[in-house]
């Protein structure tokens, strides 16, 4: 059997660190057997069998010029093997971050904090953190660790399914290369990393007969589980074309009627979502949707209890967002809360 331990990585490759002494091992001989060493493609002897180093070649203070393939052979000239030297660095602790788009699952991504220059893999696992009594030193088997399944195709991401919203988790991402391993531990709670996906299906429609109104509607993101006890609240922004500043409101449901649109101008609208109890952070903004108020005139309204004149639409101040109000149902259809303000009627 070979005297050379097979480091993780492609076969026939051995590894070292620049600036350090590197030992190459001749794979096809018995440990301690004296061998001769050559650089592949160079006939001069690098190290003879009389070196006293047996089956190993020692390169002092290796540098990039030492990278390449080496040939070792036994005393009678038999090929002991070819060895490729690759230089690089041991792993450093990877940079790890975790995020959750819903309250049942979360994913963690990682990247190297230093480039090692060597073949690298990552071991990913997690466990549930529990507060144990002072008399208990053992870790409960129900707390893990469990593997964090990695995405296929080498994407630097793993996903924990079926997480508990109120639990704390410790994520272990270990960077492994042929020169060693380095671990990053990250404590996460779903509450702090929750960031929903943006709302979907945003539509902006004019309100016939109201030249300063637009109705925006949207749906929950598809990634948000349809269960009634974890709801989302929303933030809506809108602005007329060529206008630099956004106006912001927090709708009560999945629809909002804008009452201070600029007549005749197209408006951009976008929405964002967040857990209704303020866990985590706001989602990114949805893609913008556009709509233009209708050009029709305002109809006279004759309520049953008397002749009213509808006030002309007045642009209210909406620079500061309204106080947050949770959407208490996943898919409510609510009237805009400012309709009563906008349509104040006065007696003739």
């Amino acid at each position: 059997s070979s005297p050379c331990p097979q480091a993780w990585g492609p076969p026939g490759v051995q590894y070292g660190q620049p600036g350090r002494s590197v030992k190459l091992c001749c794979p096809g001989v018995t440990a301690g057997d004296p061998v001769s060493w050559f650089r592949d493609g160079e006939p001069k002897l690098l190290q003879g069998p009389d070196s006293g180093l047996g089956h190993e070649l020692v390169l002092a203070q290796a540098d990039s010029t030492d990278e390449g393939t080496y040939i070792c052979q036994t005393l009678d000239g038999a090929l002991g093997g070819t060895v490729t030297l690759q230089l690089g660095y041991p792993p450093a602790r990877p940079v790890v971050s975790c995020q959750a788009a819903d309250y049942e699952n979360f994913s963690c991504t990682w990247s190297p904090s230093q480039i090692s220059g060597l073949p690298t893999r990552y071991l990913t696992s997690y466990r549930k953190k529990t507060v144990l009594g002072a008399d208990s030193q053992r870790r409960s088997p129900s707390t893990g660790p469990w593997p964090c399944p990695q995405d296929p195709l080498g994407a630097a991401r793993c996903v924990v399914h079926g997480a508990e919203f109120w639990s704390q988790y410790r994520i272990n991402v270990t960077e492994v290369n042929p020169l060693g391993a380095s671990t990053r531990l990250l404590d996460v709670s779903l509450q702090s990393i929750l960031r929903p996906d943006p709302p979907q299906g945003l539509r902006v429609e004019s309100v016939p007969g109201y030249p300063r109104r637009l109705r925006a509607s949207w749906t929950y993101p598809a990634s948000w589980p349809c269960q009634p006890h974890f709801l989302l609240k929303f933030r809506l922004q809108y602005r007329p074309a060529q206008h630099p500043a956004w106006s912001t409101v927090e709708p009560a449901g999945l629809e909002e009627v804008i009452t201070d649109a600029v007549a005749g101008l197209p408006h951009a609208v976008r929405v964002s979502a967040r857990d209704f109890l303020d866990a985590g952070t706001w989602s990114t903004w949805s893609p913008e949707a556009w709509g233009t108020p209708s050009t029709g005139t305002i109809p006279k309204e004759i309520p049953a209890w008397g002749q009213l004149h509808t006030q002309p639409e007045v642009e209210p101040q909406v620079d500061s967002p309204a106080p947050p109000r949770p959407s208490l149902q996943p898919h409510p259809r609510l009237l805009d809360h400012r309709d009563s303000v906008e349509q104040v009627a006065v007696l003739a």
């Epitope: 001769s36 050559f38 160079e42 006939p43 001069k44 002897l45 003879g48 040939i71 052979q73 009678d76 000239g77 038999a78 090929l79």
Partner: antibody, heavy 117, light 107 residues
Framework: QVQLQQPGAELVRPGSSVKLSCKAS????????MHWLKQRPVQGLEWIGN????????HYNQKFKDKATLTVDKSSSTAYMQLNSLTSEDSAVYYC??????????WGQGTLVTVSA | DIVLTQSPATLSLSPGERATLSCRAS??????LHWYQQKSHEAPRLLIK???QSISGIPARFSGSGSGTDFTLSFSSLETEDFAVYFC?????????FGQGTKLEIK
């Protein structure tokens, strides 16, 4: 014991080619390099190139790069050297030699190649 | 290419005498020099490798020395079967090259 068997002689026409053989026995063929050498009375010994029988990796003397092609047949433990576009300058004794990367430890008896019309 | 120059071209000595053959390289080749013996109508035979390392089965009266550019093959006491042609060979760089040979003949 190690043996390298080569034909004694080859008579060839100018401009033609010849494929010399070297059948190895008495050792594991794929464990050792096989070298080919040329010897003429005045010019002495010249190294043509070598081949690693396990992976057919070759090194050639640039002088012979366009003249010689080295191959092996592992199944029959035989090394070959093809010489093309022969001229009188190619008349010589050609040796195969088992060796390590750069040394010639065991030699065949040589094949005398005569290029003549 | 590295050129190896052997001297003398011919050396005439008697059995029992000591003999010294020389090989000079056109550039420094460390100890990457080897010696071969070739008798008439025979293939060459490796005698010494890497300037001074002996080869199994070769009589102890053959020895080698030298490093860099100057190398020597020595015979402590010539035997009748030692009269032959001797070649040096370098393995410092491609192509592997030989000296032109020294013929050791009986006086």
């Amino acid at each position: 014991q190690v043996q390298l068997q080569q034909p004694g002689a080859e008579l060839v026409r100018p401009g033609s080619s010849v494929k010399l053989s070297c059948k190895a026995s008495g050792y594991t063929f794929t464990n050792y390099w096989m070298h080919w050498l040329k010897q003429r009375p005045v010019q002495g010994l010249e190294w043509i190139g070598n081949i690693g029988p396990s992976d057919s990796k070759t090194h050639y003397n640039q002088k012979f790069k366009d003249k010689a092609t080295l191959t092996v047949d592992k199944s029959s433990s035989t090394a070959y050297m093809q010489l093309n576009s022969l001229t009188s300058e190619d008349s010589a004794v050609y040796y195969c030699a088992r060796g390590d990367y750069v040394l010639f430890t065991y030699w065949g008896q040589g094949t005398l190649v005569t290029v003549s019309a | 290419d590295i050129v190896l120059t052997q001297s003398p071209a011919t050396l005439s000595l008697s059995p029992g005498e000591r003999a010294t053959l020389s090989c000079r390289a056109s550039q420094s080749i460390s100890n990457n020099l080897h010696w071969y013996q070739q008798k008439s109508h025979e293939a060459p035979r490796l005698l010494i490798k890497y300037a001074s390392q002996s080869i199994s089965g070769i009589p102890a009266r053959f020895s080698g020395s030298g490093s860099g550019t100057d190398f020597t093959l020595s015979f402590s006491s010539l035997e009748t079967e030692d009269f032959a042609v001797y070649f040096c060979q370098q393995s410092y760089s491609w192509p592997l090259t030989f000296g032109q040979g020294t013929k050791l003949e009986i006086k």
